[in-house]
C-alpha cells in the first residue's frame, strides 16, 4: 500500500493507467485499440 507521501494530486505516483484508446477508422468507427503490438 502507498503511504501518504506517495500521493500527489490524489493519485498514487507509481500506478500507471492504460494508454489512451485509439479510434482509428473515422466517424462510423466504434472500435478502439489501446494496446499495439510490441516491437
Amino acid at each position: 500500500s502507498y503511504s501518504m507521501e506517495h500521493f500527489r494530486w490524489g493519485k498514487p505516483v507509481g500506478k500507471k493507467r492504460r494508454p489512451v484508446k485509439v479510434y482509428p477508422n473515422g466517424a462510423e468507427d466504434e472500435s478502439a485499440e489501446a494496446f499495439p503490438l510490441e516491437f
Epitope: 500521493f7 498514487p12 507509481g14
Partner: antibody, heavy 110, light 112 residues
C-alpha cells in the same frame, strides 16, 4: 459522431472560464477524451485528459490551473485563473482519432 | 511527464521527393505514438497510430517507424497537398507523477 467546443471568449486575467465540449452520436462513458490547446502561430499542447471511467490526469504545468469534468454528453475544461499566456484555440479530442472539434478561441487580455 | 522532441522544425523538399521527420520521447512509450498533419485553420488529421499503422484513408506514401524512444515519419513521393505541419504525439498511460500524452513541437513541411 461529432465533437464541438464552445465557451471561448475574451476574458480579463483572473476571471475563471469554463469551456464545454459537446459530443453527439456516442456516450462519453465509453471514450477517453483529451483537451489540447494551440496558441496563435504555435504548436499543439496537451492540457489533460479524462478516461472513460472519469479518471483525470493533467500535464504537470496544467495542474492547479485547469480542471476537467464530464457528464454523459459533455466534457468541461475550467481555466481557473486565466493569464495572457492562456490565449489559444482549445480543442477537445476523442482519444487518438480524427474526432477533433473545430476549436474554440480564448483570448485573455486586460 | 513524457516530453516529445521533434526535429527538424522545418524542412523543404521538391515535389516527388522524400522527407523524414524524427521524434524522440524522454522515456520509453513502447509503440504508443501517433502522427498528425495540420493545415492552417484546420484541426489536426490523424495519419498514423501505434507508431506504424496507417489511419483510414491515409496513402501508403506515409510511413511510420520506431518504438521505445525513437520514431520517424517518412513521406515519399511528395505532393503539393503534403505541405503542412506534422506533429508526433505520445499516448502512453499516465500516473500520478507523469502525464503520458504529449506533442512534439511540430515540423513544417514546405513543398517546392
Amino acid at each position: 459522431q461529432s465533437v464541438k467546443e464552445s465557451g471561448g471568449r475574451l476574458v480579463t486575467p483572473g476571471t475563471p472560464l469554463t469551456l464545454t465540449c459537446t459530443v453527439s452520436g456516442f456516450s462519453l462513458s465509453n471514450y477517453d477524451m483529451i483537451w489540447v490547446r494551440q496558441a496563435p502561430g504555435k504548436g499543439l499542447e496537451s492540457i489533460g485528459m479524462i478516461y472513460d471511467d472519469g479518471d483525470t490526469y493533467y500535464a504537470s504545468w496544467a495542474k492547479g490551473r485547469f480542471t476537467i469534468s464530464k457528464t454523459s454528453t459533455t466534457v468541461d475544461l475550467k481555466i481557473i485563473s486565466p493569464t495572457t499566456e492562456d490565449t489559444a484555440t482549445y480543442f477537445c479530442v476523442k482519444g487518438v482519432s480524427n474526432h477533433w472539434g473545430p476549436g474554440t478561441l480564448v483570448t485573455v487580455s486586460s | 511527464d513524457v516530453v516529445m522532441t521533434q526535429t527538424p522544425a522545418s524542412v523543404e523538399a521538391a515535389v516527388g521527393g522524400t522527407v523524414t521527420i524524427k521524434c524522440q520521447a524522454s522515456q520509453s512509450i513502447s509503440s504508443y505514438l501517433a502522427w498528425y498533419q495540420q493545415k492552417p485553420g484546420q484541426p489536426p488529421k490523424l495519419l498514423i497510430y501505434s507508431a506504424s499503422t496507417l489511419a483510414s484513408g491515409v496513402p501508403s506514401r506515409f510511413k511510420g517507424r520506431g518504438s521505445g524512444t525513437e520514431f520517424t515519419l517518412t513521406i515519399s513521393d511528395l505532393e503539393c497537398a503534403d505541405a503542412a505541419t506534422y506533429y508526433c504525439q505520445s499516448y502512453d498511460g499516465s500516473s500520478g507523477s507523469s502525464y503520458g500524452v504529449g506533442f512534439g513541437g511540430g515540423t513544417e513541411v514546405v513543398v517546392k
